[in-house]
C-alpha cells in the first residue's frame, strides 16, 4: 500500500509505485540543513552523505540528555521523505546533510548563514549538476538570511523552505519570506491546511504552494529499519524538494523561475478549504497542492504565468504597494485590490530597468495590494503605453500601436479620490482587441509585448446587475496574462488572477445600494505562444 | 574613512523577543566589499572596541555569499560598529527552529 502523501503528489492516471522510479532525481544533489541524521538508515543509506559541517548552539537546560536517536529524528525523517528508498519522493536523488539544528531542533540565523556559505563554496570548488537546498526551519523575519538566500538563488541554486508551523503570515518568518525561495505550506490527506496542536501551517502571499505535511511516513532514527509518522511544514517542503529534484533531473537546464512556474502549473488547484485561513489572508494564499508533472518532459511549449501579490500598502493617503516579478520573468499585467474599495488604481512603471506593478491607496482607504502577473516569455520585448484621462464621455482608450506587439494587460490609475459612475457603455468596440478601455477620469496603461509567435485575445464577462464577484477564465491551451475590471468605478474592490481565471470583486451590494447601471465586467486577456508550441513539437 | 555620505547603516533585530540572541551580531558590508576589506573592518572594530575597554571576538568572516563578519560583542558597541566603513547593516543573531 502506498502512503497517502506519495499517492497525492502522483498525477492522476498514474500509480505511485510505477511513477516513482528508483533513479528519479538522480542527476540532482539535494542539500539538507537540519539536525544530525542517521545516514546509514536502510531507507537512506548510500543516498545521503553527511558533510563535516556543523554549526549549532548548545542545548537549553542543564538537565538536557543528548540521546542520539532524538538528535537525529527530524533530519533523518526529512532525508527519507526526499529520497528514501521506500517512502521517498525522489528515490534517486543524492543528498548532503549539514547540521545547523541541535538536538532540540534549534539553530541560529548565523549558523544557517555559514551553512549556506559552505554550500556556495562547495558549488564553486566542485560544480555538479542542479542543486536543491532544503531549509526545513524557520525563525523571525531576517534581512540577512533572506539576502543570503537571494544570493544563493541567483547563483542558480533552488532553495525550498518550510512556511513555518505558527498558524501565521509566512511573511513574518525567514527564510519563508525570501521571494527567491520556494516556500511550502502543509496540507493533510483531506487537502486541508494542517493543524499542529493549537497552531498549524503558515499561510499568506509568501507561501508559493502547499504539499502533504501531516502523518507523513518516513525513516525513524529509533532503529535502522524503523519508520515513523511526522507532521509539519518541513515535511511539506521535503516533498517539494523531491518534486523539484525529479523535475530538474528530467530537465537539468531549468532555471529557478521556470521550476517555480512548473511547480505551480502542475499543482492541484482549488482543493484547499480556505475557511481555515483568516479571512484577510484567503485571497493572498495560493490554493495549490504540489504534484509531480504527468510527464517528465514536454511542458516547454506552455506559456506559464503566476500571480504575485505585494505587501499591503498601509492606510495612509499616498501609500502605494509594489509587486515585483522574478528577474527572468516578464510583468505582463498589473492590477490592484482594496478591501474597502478605496483605491486609486494601479500602473506599471520601470524601476531599476525592470517593470514593476504599483497600486495606489485613496483617502480613507485601509490600504491596497498590487497584483503582478508574472510570466515566462523568452525573447519578449514589452513596453507600457499610457493614455491620460480623456475627460470625454466615451472613456479613455489606449492600444498597442507598434507592429507585432500584442496587448497582454490593462491597468488604470486615477488621481481623483472617487471615480464617478460610468454610465455610457464601456465594452470595447469589437474588432479592436488590442486596446484598453477605462474610465474617462483615469489614465489607462496597456502592456504591449512582442515575442515570437505570441498571440492574445480578450475575453469579457459582464453581469448586468452588480455581483460581489465576476469571473472569466481562459480556455484550455490559453494562459491568463491580464485581468482587469470595467468600469473602474468606486464599488469595484479590484481584480486579480487566480490560476487561469480573472476575478473581479465588488463591494457587497446590500451595503452600497448600487443601481443596476453599475454593471461590472471582468476582462481577461488570454495568450498563447505558437513559437513555444512549435519548438516543443520539433523536439518531439 | 567614514561611511559614504548620506548612507546610514541600519540595525535590525528579530521582532520575536524570545528568539533574540543579543551579544552576537552579523555585520553585513556593502555588496562589492572584498574579503581583505571585511577582515580589515573586523580588525578595526576590535581595535576601536578595545580602546573603549570592550572585548570582542570575530567568530566568522563571510565571503562567497555576503561580505561581512559575525562578531560576539556588547550591544553597547553597535553605534560604533554602524559607523564603520563599508557597513551596510547589522543584524542581531536570532534563533531558528525545526518545523
Amino acid at each position: 500500500s502506498i502512503p497517502w502523501n506519495l499517492e497525492r503528489i502522483t498525477p492522476p492516471r498514474y500509480r505511485a509505485d510505477e511513477y516513482q522510479p528508483p533513479d528519479g532525481g538522480s542527476l540532482v544533489e539535494v542539500y539538507l540543513l537540519d539536525t544530525s541524521i542517521q545516514s546509514d538508515h536502510r531507507e537512506i543509506e548510500g543516498r545521503v552523505m553527511v558533510t563535516d559541517f556543523e554549526n549549532v548552539p548548545e542545548e537549553d537546560g542543564t538537565r538536557f540528555h543528548r540521546q542520539a536517536s532524538k538528535c537525529d529524528s527530524h533530519g533523518t525523517h526529512l532525508a527519507g521523505v526526499v529520497s528514501g528508498r521506500d517512502a521517498g519522493v525522489a528515490k534517486g536523488a543524492s543528498m548532503r546533510s549539514l547540521r545547523v539544528l541541535n538536538c532540540q531542533g534549534k539553530g541560529t540565523v548565523s549558523g544557517t548563514l555559514i551553512g549556506l556559505e559552505f554550500i556556495r563554496k562547495s558549488q564553486l570548488v566542485q560544480p555538479v549538476g542542479p542543486l536543491v537546498v532544503l531549509l526545513p526551519l524557520a525563525g523571525g523575519y531576517s534581512r540577512v538570511l533572506n539576502a543570503a538566500c537571494q544570493r544563493l538563488a541567483r547563483a542558480g541554486v533552488v532553495l525550498v523552505t518550510a512556511a513555518g508551523n505558527f498558524r501565521d503570515d509566512a511573511c513574518l518568518y525567514s527564510p519563508a519570506s525570501a521571494p527567491e525561495v520556494i516556500t511550502v505550506g502543509a496540507t493533510n490527506a483531506q487537502d486541508q491546511p494542517v493543524t499542529l496542536g493549537t497552531l498549524g501551517t503558515n499561510f499568506g502571499r509568501c507561501v508559493d504552494l502547499f504539499a502533504p505535511g501531516e502523518d507523513i511516513i518516513g525513516a525513524s532514527s529509533d532503529c535502522s529499519t524503523c519508520f515513523v509518522s511526522q507532521s509539519g511544514t518541513s515535511q511539506a517542503a521535503a516533498h517539494v524538494a523531491g518534486i523539484a529534484a525529479m523535475m530538474l533531473s528530467a530537465e537539468p537546464e531549468l532555471t529557478l523561475a521556470e521550476l517555480r512556474q512548473r511547480l505551480i502549473h502542475f499543482s492541484a488547484k482549488d482543493v484547499i478549504n480556505e475557511a481555515w485561513f483568516p479571512e484577510d489572508q484567503r485571497v493572498l494564499t495560493p490554493n495549490l497542492v504540489a504534484a509531480l508533472p504527468p510527464s517528465t518532459h514536454g511542458a516547454g511549449w506552455q506559456l506559464f504565468c503566476r500571480t504575485v501579490w505585494s505587501a499591503h500598502s498601509g492606510p495612509t493617503r499616498m501609500a502605494t504597494a509594489i509587486a515585483r516579478c522574478a528577474p527572468d520573468e516578464e510583468l505582463l499585467s498589473c492590477s490592484s485590490f482594496s478591501r474597502s474599495g478605496k483605491r486609486r488604481g494601479e500602473r506599471m512603471e520601470a524601476q531599476g530597468g525592470k517593470l514593476v506593478c504599483r497600486a495606489h491607496n485613496a483617502f480613507g482607504g485601509e490600504g491596497v495590494y498590487a497584483i503582478a502577473r508574472c510570466c515566462l516569455l523568452p525573447q519578449a520585448n514589452c513596453s507600457v503605453h499610457t493614455a491620460p484621462p480623456a475627460e470625454a464621455s466615451m472613456g479613455t482608450r489606449v492600444h498597442c500601436h507598434q507592429q507585432g506587439h500584442v496587448l497582454t494587460g490593462c491597468s488604470s490609475h486615477w488621481e481623483v479620490e472617487d471615480l464617478g459612475t460610468h454610465k455610457p457603455p464601456v465594452l470595447r468596440p469589437r474588432g479592436q482587441p488590442n486596446q484598453c478601455v477605462g474610465h474617462r477620469e483615469a489614465s489607462i496603461h496597456a502592456s504591449c509585448c512582442h515575442a515570437p509567435g505570441l498571440e492574445c485575445k480578450v475575453k469579457e464577462h459582464g453581469i448586468p446587475a452588480p455581483q460581489e464577484q465576476v469571473t472569466v477564465a481562459c480556455e484550455e491551451g490559453w494562459t491568463l496574462t491580464g485581468c482587469s475590471a470595467l468600469p473602474g468605478t468606486s464599488h469595484v474592490l479590484g481584480a486579480y488572477a487566480v490560476d487561469n481565471t480573472c476575478v473581479v470583486r465588488s463591494r457587497d451590494v446590500s451595503t452600497t445600494g448600487s443601481t443596476s447601471e453599475e454593471a461590472v465586467t471582468a476582462v481577461a486577456i488570454c495568450c498563447r505562444s505558437r513559437h513555444l508550441a512549435q519548438a516543443s513539437q520539433e523536439l518531439q | 574613512e567614514a561611511p559614504e555620505h548620506g548612507t546610514t547603516a541600519t540595525f535590525h533585530r528579530c521582532a520575536k523577543d524570545p528568539w533574540r540572541l543579543p551579544g552576537t551580531y552579523v555585520v553585513v558590508l556593502k555588496e562589492e566589499t572584498h574579503l581583505s576589506q571585511s577582515e580589515r573592518t573586523a580588525r578595526r572594530l576590535q581595535a576601536q572596541a578595545a580602546r573603549r575597554g570592550y572585548l570582542t571576538k570575530i567568530l566568522h568572516v563571510f565571503h562567497g555569499l555576503l561580505p561581512g563578519f559575525l562578531v560576539k560583542m556588547s550591544g553597547d558597541l553597535l553605534e560604533l560598529a554602524l559607523k564603520l566603513p563599508h557597513v551596510d547593516y547589522i543584524e542581531e543573531d536570532s534563533s531558528v527552529f525545526a518545523q
Epitope: 528508483p22 546509514d40 536502510r42 543509506e45 548510500g46 545521503v48 553527511v50 528508498r85 | -
Partner: antibody, heavy 115, light 107 residues
Framework: QVQLVQSGAEVKKPGASVKVSCKAS????????ISWVRQAPGQGLEWMGW????????NYAQKLQGRGTMTTDPSTSTAYMELRSLRSDDTAVYYC????????WGQGTTVTVSS | DIQMTQSPSSLSASVGDRVTITCRAS??????LDWYQQKPGKAPKLLIY???TRPSGVPSRFSGSGSGTDFTLTISSLQPEDFATYYC?????????FGQGTKVEIK
C-alpha cells in the same frame, strides 16, 4: 578505492568463539552500516545481520538466537562479528558487505569448526 | 521470511548465447530485487539492484527486469568470464533472503 578487508581464516573447536574483523576504507563509514553474510560449503548465501558504524545499532537474523554479536570501532573503521558456542554447522565462509544494499563485499573469512 | 526460488538451478550454455535466469518471490517485493554473480572461491559481486539498475562498471550485456513476484536476469551474449553462479536476493523485507543460486556452466 572502496574496499572491505577481512581477517584471516580461523579453525575452532565446537563450543568455542570466533571474532571476525572487517576493515572499511575508501568511503565515509558513517553513511553505511555493515552486513554479515555466511556461506556454508557448497551452499547458498545467508544474511546474518547488520551493524552501524554511526551508533552501534544492530539488526540480527533470528537464527543467530543470541549467539552472535556485531560491533564496530569507528576509530579504526573496523566492524566485528563474534559467534559463540560454535557448532560444526557454523563452518562457512563469513563475508562482510557494505550496508543493507551490499554493494561492496569483503574477500571472506573461512571459519572451520571441527573437533 | 520471504522465500526466493530461482530456476533453473543450473544451465549449460556456449559463449555468445543469450541466457535467462528467473527468480520468484513468495510474496510481492515491488522492485526490490538484486542479482549477484559469484565465482568459485570469490565473494559475490552486485550485478543489478532494484530489479533493473546496473551499478557502474557492470557490462551492459547484463540486464534485469520484473516487478512484484517474478523477475528475470538476462545475459544478452554470454562471455567466457560470465561462467559463475548467480543469486537473486530480495531487499524488500528484513531479513534479506537469497535464492538458492543458478550455476551457469560451459556447454
Amino acid at each position: 578505492q572502496v574496499q572491505l578487508v577481512q581477517s584471516g581464516a580461523e579453525v575452532k573447536k565446537p563450543g568455542a568463539s570466533v571474532k571476525v574483523s572487517c576493515k572499511a576504507s575508501g568511503y565515509a563509514i558513517y553513511n553505511y552500516g555493515i552486513s554479515w553474510v555466511r556461506q556454508a560449503p557448497g551452499q547458498g548465501l545467508e544474511w546474518m545481520g547488520w551493524v552501524s558504524f554511526y551508533n552501534g545499532n544492530t539488526n540480527y537474523a533470528q537464527k543467530l538466537q543470541g549467539r552472535g554479536t556485531m560491533t564496530t570501532d569507528p576509530s579504526t573503521s573496523t566492524a566485528y562479528m563474534e559467534l559463540r558456542s560454535l557448532r560444526s554447522d557454523d563452518t562457512a565462509v563469513y563475508y562482510c558487505a557494505r550496508g543493507y544494499v551490499m554493494d561492496i563485499w569483503g574477500q571472506g573469512t573461512t571459519v572451520t569448526v571441527s573437533s | 521470511d520471504i522465500q526466493m526460488t530461482q530456476s533453473p538451478s543450473s544451465l549449460s550454455a556456449s559463449v555468445g548465447d543469450r541466457v535467462t535466469i528467473t527468480c520468484r518471490a513468495s510474496q510481492s517485493i515491488n522492485n526490490w530485487l538484486d542479482w549477484y554473480q559469484q565465482k568459485p572461491g570469490k565473494a559475490p559481486k552486485l550485478l543489478i539492484y532494484a530489479a533493473s539498475t546496473r551499478p557502474s562498471g557492470v557490462p551492459s550485456r547484463f540486464s534485469g527486469s520484473g516487478s512484484g513476484t517474478d523477475f528475470t536476469l538476462t545475459i544478452s551474449s554470454l562471455q567466457p568470464e560470465d561462467f559463475a553462479t548467480y543469486y537473486c536476493q530480495q531487499d524488500q523485507d528484513i531479513p534479506p533472503t537469497f535464492g538458492q543460486g543458478t550455476k551457469v556452466e560451459i556447454k
